[in-house]
Interface confidence: medium
């Protein structure tokens, strides 16, 4: 399964911070960065860095300390940018992350200094089963971006 998350401040549940996505092993979490056609909003485009953090970092929406891992940067608001995280128990890649069944992982975005964005938060709950099929389950929508 591919679970698509449109990561932008038009997504009410990401804003509130109580969005939950349930993923199984071998699923993919696809993060779609904000995208603008033309000049973008008057307050400027949303650009940010996405981090995986621990619970205190999620609560405070702060990506600091040894348990904050920068995963991606959405810094090209006029391009089509998407990142993917494979939910797997073991990873062959040095930049990959290993996910344990039954655990919850926390993602936050920290706006860049020049950005109009707000703090956005997502909880990823990893379930137990390995899945083989592929279909899409988006969270959020392209919204205004």
């Amino acid at each position: 399964l591919r679970h698509v998350v449109y990561w932008n401040s038009s997504n009410p549940r990401l804003l509130r911070g109580d969005a939950v996505v349930e993923l199984g092993l071998n699923d993919y979490l696809d993060i779609v960065c904000p995208h603008y056609e033309g000049p973008g909003p008057p307050e400027g485009p949303e650009t940010f860095a996405l981090y995986m953090v621990d619970w205190p970092g999620y609560e405070s929406c702060q990506a600091e300390g040894p348990r904050a891992y920068k995963r991606w940067v959405c810094s090209l608001p006029f391009g089509h940018v998407q990142f993917s995280e494979k939910i797997q128990r073991f990873t062959p890649f040095s930049l990959g992350f290993e996910f344990l069944p039954g655990e919850t992982y926390y993602y936050i975005s920290v706006p860049t200094p020049e950005s109009s964005g707000q703090c956005l938060r997502l909880q990823v709950s990893v379930c137990c089963k390995e899945r083989k099929s592929e279909s899409a389950h988006p969270v959020g929508s392209p919204g205004e971006s």
Epitope: R13, V20, E22, E59, S60, P138, V139, G140
Partner: antibody, heavy 112, light 107 residues
Framework: QVQLKQSGPGLVAPSQSLSITCTVS????????VDWVRQSPGKGLEWLGV???????NYNSALKSRLSISKDNSKSQVFLKMNSLQTDDTAMYYC??????WGQGTLVTVSA | DIVMTQSQKFMSTSVGDRVTVTCKAS??????VAWFQQKSGQSPKPLIH???YRYSGVPDRFTGSGSGTDFTLTITNVQSEDLVAYFC?????????FGGGTKLEIK
């Protein structure tokens, strides 16, 4: 334009079950979570539960034994079913998409 | 369950005034608090999330603040259409719970 429209019976007899349908437009149910809330003069606003885009649910533990939330993505419909209604279940029942968009409400009266 | 207490069921104010609606949580909820406005006969409308962030389209005369257990919704330059009910909600823990509401009335 996001809209949620509710349909369901206005009057339910005690001990019977309640079914309300929330039909959404302007977005896909695989996109956002949908919460159910009820409001009564006695209990105020009370969160009943949520169904997430992927289909998983969370319920208010006080009502979990008689509450069920399900959906049909292809028909853009979310269903609330509550069993064994009593008079204190009389309330306005709302569906809400990610708290930003709300249905118009369904007034449910439990009475013989 | 976390209890959200809005101690004032009614508050009197005048158009142009500044009014502060309070909400107290029975335990620490961080900043996982939202505020809703409800006009008579209508569904609740979200105003504030994460204790202090306005939703898009909400006038800037509405300001939320607080963290932990004490939260406020401040309305500056109150307009006649603001004389309705306001509810706080915590979403730190299931079940999500609401305050009993505060209705603004004309002095």
């Amino acid at each position: 334009q996001v809209q949620l429209k509710q349909s369901g019976p206005g009057l339910v007899a005690p001990s019977q079950s309640l079914s309300i349908t929330c039909t959404v437009s302007g977005f896909s149910l695989t996109t956002y979570g949908v919460d159910w809330v009820r409001q009564s003069p006695g209990k105020g606003l009370e969160w009943l539960g949520v169904i997430w885009g992927g289909g998983s649910t969370n319920y208010n533990s006080a009502l979990k034994s008689r509450l069920s939330i399900s959906k049909d993505n292809s028909k853009s419909q979310v269903f609330l079913k509550m069993n064994s209604l009593q008079t204190d279940d009389t309330a306005m029942y709302y569906c809400a998409s990610d708290w930003a968009y709300w249905g118009q409400g369904t007034l449910v009266t439990v009475s013989a | 369950d976390i209890v959200m207490t809005q101690s004032q069921k009614f508050m009197s104010t005048s158009v142009g005034d500044r009014v502060t609606v309070t909400c107290k949580a029975s335990q620490n909820v961080g900043t996982n608090v939202a505020w809703f406005q409800q006009k008579s006969g209508q569904s609740p409308k979200p105003l504030i999330h994460s204790a202090s962030y306005r939703y898009s389209g909400v006038p800037d005369r509405f300001t939320g603040s607080g963290s932990g257990t004490d939260f406020t919704l401040t309305i500056t330059n109150v307009q006649s259409e603001d004389l309705v009910a306001y509810f706080c909600q915590q979403y730190k823990r299931y079940p999500y719970t609401f305050g009993g509401g505060t209705k603004l009335e004309i002095k």
